[in-house]
């Protein structure tokens, strides 16, 4: 196990992840169906899940829920035991994801719904679907930090990025992001790289000259497409691309992010702000390592929980993503990419073993809280019983955790097929993505197979049932590795399930007489809304008991039944981490104090608006960021970064009123404006029509149940399609434009072409 004590980093940037326009599962959790990933993970495998619409067409993307983002609360509430402030994990600074970072790399991409994760997480409390990331478990930072930490992860449930990660989506498979959040720049890259640069003959330059073909397609997102439920049209579980069984969900899981931390206390959103400003966080440098490919055997995770009392919490996250390396998550698994997305091929290659975690100095002025640290070593055993490479070696050693930092970028660049694109195929070589600031861990070890996944589309006869016309060789959709684990049944929108091609793809002229009942779209049955797996009811603040035996039936099934988890010292642990005994660590009696310090926003770079304009209203539940004509062109932080949103505990709605949003092309707003955001066919009106930026994704305060920042722009832009800034999804496609939900098709095209270097 990578260090036994891996602190699961809070993905600062989860924000985008949950709720990035992905389906929102119950509880407001955005279900990002890993299309593939989930399936692989045994997460929801909704065959043919209808992708959520970008929403680009319709604000409420077809999947009505698709875009709704989980409420902050939903995201943060999970498992965090509010009771033990002392336990609160030190807030991890809200790390900004580098502009170039793909959403996936950044971990911003859609993340599996909490539910999914919840269901499958090992040892999760049945109800708390969320596993507190160990990072959360980290030594308590200032009280309330946990919450905020959570907040720091926009939308990130406590659960590590989910199961899908755990399950490691097959490369290229991903839940539908519905065009989500790659950063505009990234989008451009991808787009550029992708479409045109893709294989086609290089497009000629205006001059008619052919542009050099792209070097290599960077399929950065491929690995991770986290969100599209639709990915697999048919339910047929197709093996993960890696061929990993869904079980491999434990991404090398050195540490199981999902390991519930009982004592974790949700931190107030403000915390994040504070933390982000106050607490330096070391961002994991290393790319996330996907599991080594080929590890098909499900890993058994044995959690060794060591509770070391009075361990000085390391503020720095040098270890940060130790587990990361361990997690087999698909490299860069999409939004959840653990680290920078490694190229598909890069699935964890020989990543150097990170040095042991070094305690990071606590931020100055912050006393190091000594709180027993629950160290969970997750010993992942492959079916063969051996731990993953990482796991094997690390099962017991704490220090062995690999630190991804400095991990060489292993992602092999996918050789670019000869530029076949008619368009230029400038392809950017796959570069090691920067490690996302907050890699997301997939916590759910056990992949749950959604009931939907269980459903097999029955072939419909010519009697009028849905037929899947499958080109030869085309494997029926939905062939995704299905996890054995029982997944929470998800409603699966009828997905066309092409019968698994039995060796021979249907011949193209042949009617693939496959009609599969259940095929999506059986007349009237087809619903674009991705089926929302019914998440187990989660109580927002349950402390995930580290107990191995899953308590809730569903969770039990979904969880890998860890062999008796050797919890060496647990017998000495008298109280649950969140138990009151631990509260003593917090003088406050476990009260999480959300101190809304007025952050010096001057330092906060928020794309949402100038920091200066953000006025924190302590008592006002609504923070209104009044935008004077703000020149966002230079703003680099994500709109919605928690640091920028001062969530008032009571705050309900954050309204960002922009008098004039001067989105310059330069604005690299992760929130969905591509650099090209100015490209509004409407003539350049840069004003965004009142769009609600649902910062639920980003606003994490528990109290903020999805505070929505209303982006009110006095001037209605002529753009017929307002940019859905909230739709930040990581799309690996070159045609990434989806992600930002550029205001117009032209923007998307431009972004895509820009990516391609066209």
């Amino acid at each position: 196990m990578a260090e036994p004590r891996q602190e699961f980093e809070v993905m600062e940037d989860h924000a985008g992840t949950y709720g990035l326009g992905d389906r929102k599962d119950q509880g407001g959790y955005t279900m990002h169906q890993d299309q593939e990933g989930d399936t692989d993970a045994g997460l929801k495998e909704s065959p043919l899940q209808t992708p959520t619409e970008d929403g680009s067409e319709e604000p409420g993307s077809e999947t009505s829920d698709a875009k709704s983002t989980p409420t902050a609360e939903d995201v943060t509430a999970p498992l965090v035991d509010e009771g033990a402030p002392g336990k609160q994990a030190a807030a991890q600074p809200h790390t900004e994801i580098p502009e170039g970072t793909t959403a996936e790399e950044a971990g911003i991409g859609d993340t599996p719904s909490l539910e999914d994760e919840a269901a499958g997480h090992v040892t999760q409390e049945p109800e708390s679907g969320k596993v507190v990331q160990e990072g959360f478990l980290r030594e308590p930072g200032p009280p309330g930090l946990s919450h905020q930490l959570m907040s720091g992860m926009p939308g990130a449930p406590l659960l590590p990025e989910g199961p899908r990660e755990a399950t490691r989506q097959p490369s290229g498979t991903g839940p539908e992001d519905t065009e989500g959040g790659r950063h505009a720049p990234e989008l451009l890259k991808h787009q550029l790289l992708g479409d045109l640069h893709q294989e086609g003959p290089p497009l000629k330059g205006a001059g008619g000259k052919e542009r050099p073909g792209s070097k290599e397609e960077v399929d950065e997102d491929r690995d991770v497409d986290e969100s599209s439920p639709q990915d697999s049209p048919p339910s047929k579980a197709s093996p993960a691309q890696d061929g990993r069984p869904p079980q491999t969900a434990a991404r090398e899981a050195t540490s199981i992010p999902g390991f519930p931390a009982e004592g974790a206390i949700p931190l107030p959103v403000d915390f994040l702000s504070k933390v982000s400003t106050e607490i330096p966080a070391s961002e994991p440098d290393g790319p996330s390592v996907g599991r080594a490919k080929g590890q098909d055997a499900p890993l058994e995770f044995t959690f060794h929980v060591e509770i070391t009392p009075n361990v000085q919490k390391e503020q720095a996250h040098s270890e940060e993503h130790l587990g990361r390396a361990a997690f087999p998550g698909a490299p860069g698994e999409g939004p959840e990419a653990r680290g920078p997305s490694l190229g598909e091929d890069t699935k964890e290659a020989d990543l150097p073993e990170p040095s042991e975690k070094q305690p990071a100095a606590a931020p100055r002025g912050k006393p190091v809280s000594r709180v027993p640290q629950l160290k969970a070593r997750m010993v992942s055993k492959s079916k063969d019983g051996t731990g993953s490479d990482d796991k094997k070696a690390k099962t017991s050693t704490r220090s062995s955790a690999k630190t991804l930092k400095n991990r060489p970028c292993l992602s092999p660049k996918h050789p670019t097929p000869g530029s076949s694109d008619p368009l230029i195929q400038p392809s950017s070589p796959a570069v090691c993505p920067e490690p996302p600031s907050s890699p997301k861990y997939v916590s759910s070890v056990t992949s749950r197979t959604g009931s939907s996944g269980a459903k097999e589309m029955k072939l419909k006869g010519a009697d009028g049932k849905t037929k899947i016309a499958t080109p030869r060789g085309a494997a029926p959709p939905g062939q995704k590795g299905q996890a054995n684990a029982t997944r929470i049944p998800a409603k699966t929108p009828p997905a066309p399930k092409t019968p698994p091609s039995s060796g021979e793809p249907p011949k193209s002229g042949d009617r693939s007489g496959y009609s599969s009942p259940g095929s999506p779209g059986t007349p009237g049955s087809r619903s674009r809304t991705p089926s929302l797996p019914t998440p187990p009811t989660r109580e927002p603040k349950k402390v995930a008991v580290v107990r191995t035996p899953p308590k809730s039936p569903s969770s039990a099934k979904s969880r890998l039944q860890t062999a008796p988890v050797p919890m060496p010292d647990l017998k000495n642990v008298k109280s649950k981490i969140g138990s009151t005994e631990n509260l003593k660590h917090q003088p406050g009696g476990g009260k999480v104090q959300i101190i809304n310090k007025k952050l010096d926003l001057s330092n906060v770079q928020s794309k949402c608006g100038s920091k200066d304009n953000i006025k924190h209203v302590p008592g006002g539940g609504s923070v209104q960021i009044v935008y004077k004509p703000v020149d966002l062109s230079k703003v680099t932080s994500k709109c919605g970064s928690l640091g920028n949103i001062h969530h008032k505990p009571g705050g309900g709605q954050v309204e960002v009123k922009s008098e004039k949003l001067d989105f310059k092309d330069r604005v690299q707003s992760k929130i969905g404006s591509l650099d090209n955001i100015t490209h509004v066919p409407g003539g350049g009106n840069k004003k965004i029509e009142t769009h609600k930026l649902t910062f639920r994704e980003n606003a994490k305060a528990k109290t903020d149940h999805g505070a929505e920042i209303v982006y009110k722009s006095p001037v209605v832009s002529g753009d017929t399609s307002p940019r859905h800034l909230s739709n930040v999804s990581s799309t690996g496609s070159i045609d990434m434009v989806d992600s930002p939900q550029l205001a117009t098709l032209a923007d998307e095209v431009s972004a895509s072409l820009a990516k391609q270097g066209l």
Partner: antibody, heavy 115, light 112 residues
Framework: QVQLQQPGAELVRPGASVILSCKAS????????IHWVKQRPGRVLEWIGR????????RYNENFKSKATLTVDKPSSTAYMQLSSLTSEDSAVYFC????????WGQGTTLTVSS | DIVITQDELSNPVTSGESVSISCRSS???????????LNWFLQRPGQSPQLLIY???TRASGVSDRFSVSGSGTDFTLEISRVQAEDVGVYYC?????????FGGGTKLEIK
């Protein structure tokens, strides 16, 4: 080389649903959108919608939202379009094309809706 | 939706001659970024459309330089010089400024 393979024809009864497939090869499937375009005999091309294979995000022509559902299966690099409640009006050639610019097109699947 | 209108060429052209195919948009396709979001496709008989020109003036790979586009804003002309037999087919212009993508009705080019 980039190729989008589509079945040549589909015969379906009215009221039924059909799933047309488009298998992509020669490029990274998740890097480019897959569009679906309808062409009725009159030569007119109608854009139905597009899906981002990477994210599953979709965009539909309002005229087809209730008719088509786009999905993808990444593992097989195949895009699917389900057409429901078929009527004779849906009889047409359906093409899938790649990328924002529709730089590559499949050969099209001729869908015949007939009782 | 943006409506794209194309004239049908009813008169066959002689090989070697030049021909102009017009395309009109109900809305300017010149985007604020200075690019004109207009594509041209050729659909040869029995085949699927193929991209000829994108963003109004850039030829797709492999496309002959005999094809050029002129015009701006809402009126465009695809000019094919020295028409050849292989140029026969239906030419479609497509706007990429706003969703939904819309295509013109197509102009059929025939050679005498």
């Amino acid at each position: 080389q980039v190729q989008l393979q589509q079945p040549g024809a589909e015969l379906v009864r009215p009221g039924a649903s059909v799933i047309l497939s488009c298998k992509a090869s020669g490029y990274t499937f998740t890097n480019s959108w897959i569009h679906w375009v309808k062409q009725r005999p009159g030569r007119v091309l109608e854009w139905i919608g597009r899906i981002d294979p990477n994210s599953g995000g979709t965009r539909y022509n309002e005229n087809f939202k209730s008719k088509a559902t786009l999905t993808v299966d990444k593992p097989s690099s195949t895009a699917y379009m389900q057409l429901s409640s078929l009527t004779s009006e849906d009889s047409a050639v359906y093409f899938c094309s790649r990328g924002v610019l529709h730089d590559y097109w499949g050969q099209g699947t001729t869908l015949t809706v007939s009782s | 939706d943006i409506v794209i209108t194309q004239d049908e060429l009813s008169n066959p052209v002689t090989s070697g001659e030049s021909v102009s195919i017009s395309c009109r948009s109900s809305k300017s396709l010149l985007y604020k970024d200075g690019k004109t979001y207009l594509n041209w496709f050729l659909q040869r008989p029995g085949q699927s459309p193929q991209l000829l020109i994108y963003l109004m003036s850039t030829r797709a790979s492999g496309v002959s330089d005999r094809f050029s586009v002129s015009g701006s804003g809402t009126d465009f002309t695809l000019e094919i010089s020295r028409v050849q037999a292989e140029d026969v087919g239906v030419y479609y212009c497509q706007q990429l400024v706003e969703y939904p993508y819309t295509f013109g009705g197509g102009t059929k080019l025939e050679i005498k």
